[in-house]
């Protein structure tokens, strides 16, 4: 699987999950989140050659098409597969509230 | 929706479904499919700017990150959303067989 265990410990050039830290204020302009100040969101990057973690029948066909037509602009793309939530603390006035923000962290990628 | 109805009738530059015809023999090297000789597989292409048909909370966050950090390599990607099957005819010896190949045709795209 193209997950953090594999991708973070390798020099994989093909589609893999990459490290990305997002600072809520600086990178998103969000002042409303109190904790954490930012988080490891990660992102997916890398080419999707034929047989590389292909998602559907269609993506397999497209990768094969790409192999036969190397100059084509039609190719599978490296996108998130498994996403995890992020617990945050924000304030409603002076009162702290805890919330789970769903689908915020990329754990693995796929070619789609 | 970034579907064939909208995308094929517009000059949309952002993520949209595009026309792509795949010839089974020429483009895939598949000789085993008797009918059809090829099909309109379509593909997804175009940038995913902030607010453009974003799939999950993560893709919205990543697009917002991208807006604040225009030079970043982390950005959502245009990939298939709705896929449809393709009925085909192939031969087992001299005996024709009809089969549905699932997830073969792109009907719409999303930014993931």
């Amino acid at each position: 699987a193209l997950d953090t265990n594999y991708c973070f410990s390798s020099t994989e050039k093909n589609c893999c999950v990459r490290q990305l830290y997002i600072d809520f204020r600086k990178d998103l302009g969000w002042k409303w989140i109190h904790e954490p100040k930012g988080y490891h969101a990660n992102f997916c990057l890398g080419p999707c050659p034929y047989i590389w973690s292909l998602d559907t029948q269609y993506s397999k066909v497209l990768a094969l098409y790409n192999q036969h037509n190397p100059g084509a602009s039609a190719a599978p793309c490296c996108v998130p597969q498994a996403l995890e939530p992020l617990p945050i603390v924000y304030y409603v006035g002076r009162k702290p509230k805890v919330e789970q923000l769903s689908n915020m962290i990329v754990r693995s990628c796929k070619c789609s | 929706a970034l579907d064939t109805n909208y995308c094929f009738s517009s000059t949309e530059k952002n993520c949209c479904v595009r026309q792509l015809y795949i010839d089974f023999r020429k483009d895939l090297g598949w000789k085993w499919i008797h009918e059809p000789k090829g099909y309109h597989a379509n593909f997804c292409l175009g940038p995913c700017p902030y607010i453009w048909s974003l799939d999950t909370q993560y893709s919205k966050v990543l697009a917002l990150y991208n807006q604040h950090n225009p030079g970043a390599s982390a950005a959502p990607c245009c990939v298939p959303q709705a896929l449809e099957p393709l009925p085909i005819v192939y031969y087992v010896g001299r005996k024709p067989k009809v089969e549905q190949l699932s997830n073969m045709i792109v009907r719409s795209c999303k930014c993931s």
Partner: antibody
Framework: QVQLVQSGAEVKKPGSSVKVSCKAS????????ISWVRQAPGKGLQWVGG????????NYAQRFKGRVTLTADTSTNTVYMELSNLRTEDTAVYYC?????????????WGQGTLVTVSS | ETVLTQSPGTLSLSPGERATLSCRAS???????LAWYQQKPGQAPRLLIY???SRAPGVPARFSGSGSGTDFTLTISSLEPEDFAVYYC?????????FGQGTKLEIK
């Protein structure tokens, strides 16, 4: 420049619902919380609630809980306020306003207001 | 909920005079959870002061805010003709956000 443009005036019957829209432009929509404030004719200001775009976290004044729903559509930079089970005392001008950044905060830009009249 | 009481209800002054508007909270708001707005007939409110004493962008220097705890003041050092309007204080320390009932500043 920052602009909040609201939908037009509405006349509703008691017991029905109303949905008011507020389209934002001129700034990064998802970076600020949007609050809704109402003002009955000749009266003061009353906070309805606020919504955080992207994550769709909403906070409501207790008196409106169960009757009001605030949502944000990031694809169109639009926030919606839906108020159900309308009463005659809900007749007011409803304003959307951008907060300075926190869930409860001062409001630096306001829409032009939407008059909702509830009458039988 | 936190009740804000503004005084006076109406203030009659002439251009050039100094205006002092008061806002009292039913419980302590600390030092930075109060805002002041100006509203003219048929218009939306306009933010003047936030954090009790910070002037919003574009607001003239004649407007100033002060106070902490339960007592807050908006001062207009020298009234201009365009300053005659209704003024509201707002607290955002606790949910729900509440507003004072307003002070009407009218020309004497």
């Amino acid at each position: 420049q920052v602009q909040l443009v609201q939908s037009g005036a509405e006349v509703k019957k008691p017991g029905s619902s109303v949905k008011v829209s507020c389209k934002a432009s001129g700034y990064t929509f998802s970076s600020n919380v949007i609050s809704w404030v109402r003002q009955a004719p000749g009266k003061g200001l009353q906070w309805v609630g606020g919504v955080i775009p992207i994550v769709d976290i909403a906070n409501y004044a207790q008196r409106f809980k169960g009757r009001v729903t605030l949502t944000a559509d990031t694809s169109t930079n639009t926030v919606y306020m839906e108020l159900s089970n309308l009463r005659t005392e809900d007749t007011a001008v409803y304003y959307c306003a951008r907060t300075l950044g926190l869930v409860l905060d001062a409001m630096d830009y306001w829409g032009q207001g939407t008059l909702v009249t509830v009458s039988s | 909920e936190t009740v804000l009481t503004q005084s006076p209800g109406t203030l009659s002054l002439s251009p050039g005079e100094r205006a002092t508007l008061s806002c009292r909270a039913s419980q302590s708001l600390g030092s930075s959870y109060l805002a002041w707005y100006q509203q003219k007939p048929g218009q939306a409110p306009r933010l003047l002061i936030y954090g009790a004493s910070s002037r919003a962008p574009g607001v003239p220097a004649r407007f100033s805010g002060s106070g902490s705890g339960t007592d807050f003041t908006l001062t207009i050092s020298s009234l201009e003709p365009e300053d005659f309007a209704v003024y509201y204080c707002q607290q955002y320390a606790d949910s729900p956000i509440t507003f004072g009932q307003g002070t009407k500043l009218e020309i004497k």
